[in-house]
């Protein structure tokens, strides 16, 4: 297992499969998208990333989904952070939360290969998908709940879909939302978000 020394005092050493879902719509400028990516990289620095502890996936979503990192990718944490920083700005007209939750349900968590770990999708959303695209939204959120995937929506800016955020929160008590007025608030909320995610995950059982 490829590990590296911790970079920060707070370091989440839990059993966790964490998926970062990044809104690739033009509701975020390219500069704001860069701040979003920096937030993801900062969060990754605070996780004990390895196949044994915290596994991460990074997906950018627009009208479809583009995975940059998969949960099973065996790379150094520093290399995974580098890849996360390289996520391309799509600046697309639409970012479909329904599509990315469907992708999370049927692609990322299709098979549960680590039942002992917590599963969390951090949904970073700054836009609203058209209504025609959101028909199955609740079904996908419920499907994720059945697979014990916690969905943490982070609404960013004035165009984030608050209705969908509230629907996600209603599905499970763990689905706690963070609503921010702009990307500028990500840094100040980062430690609270990391702590919340980490607290949801179990510690490794002591060696027998």
């Amino acid at each position: 297992d490829i590990s590296e020394p911790p970079l920060h005092d707070f370091y989440c050493s839990r059993l966790l499969d964490l998926v970062f879902l990044l809104d690739g719509s033009s509701r975020l400028s390219e500069a704001e998208f860069e701040v979003l990516k920096a937030f993801v990289v900062d969060m990754m620095e605070r996780l004990r990333i390895s196949q044994k502890w915290v596994r991460v996936a990074v997906v950018e979503y627009h009208d479809g989904s583009h995975a940059y990192i998969g949960l099973k990718d065996r790379k150094r944490p520093s290399e995974l952070r580098r890849i996360a920083s390289q996520v391309k700005y799509a600046g697309s007209q639409v970012a479909s939360t329904s599509e990315v939750l469907k992708y999370t349900l049927f692609q990322i968590f299709s098979k549960i290969d680590r039942p002992e770990a917590s599963r969390i999708a951090l949904l970073l959303m700054a836009s609203q998908e058209p209504q025609r695209m959101s028909r199955n939204f609740v079904r996908y959120v419920q499907g994720l709940k059945k697979k014990k995937v916690i969905v943490i929506p982070v609404g960013i800016g004035p165009h984030a879909n608050l209705k969908q955020i509230r629907l996600i929160e209603k599905q499970a008590p763990e689905n706690k939302a963070f609503v921010l007025s702009s990307v500028d608030e990500l840094e100040q909320q980062r430690d609270e978000i990391v702590s919340y995610l980490c607290d949801l995950a179990p510690e490794a059982p002591p060696p027998t």
């Epitope: 390219e30 701040v35 580098r82 390289q86």
Partner: nanobody, 122 residues
Framework: QVQLVESGGGLVQAGGSLRLSCAAS?????MAWFRQPPGKEREFVAV????????LVAASVKGRFTISRDNAKNTVYLQMTSLKPADTAVYYC??????????????????WGQGTQVTVSS
Amino acid sequence: QVQLVESGGGLVQAGGSLRLSCAASGRTKDMAWFRQPPGKEREFVAVIYSSDGSTLVAASVKGRFTISRDNAKNTVYLQMTSLKPADTAVYYCATSRGYSGTYYSTSRYDYWGQGTQVTVSS
């Protein structure tokens, strides 16, 4: 190979203004300004993106410094106002080939100018 040439530095009194320019020899995506105060590390100041003209400015200079670009001239500017002695540094222009590393890290940028000295006297 992109070449970057900075100009516009000089000596200015506290409270004064300066405009730095950085001319690029080829097409660039993001263009950034960094600065290196005497005896300190190089630090991020501002960046501008060609796709939509959006910008990011370091918290330490927000409200005083503005970054802009002229795509026709392939030039980026850093307008600095209300200058303080703490702004004294060599200012560098930088650009990247790809997007590897966070926007504020020096490792992200592949091409650098030679730097222009800005001295703010009290």
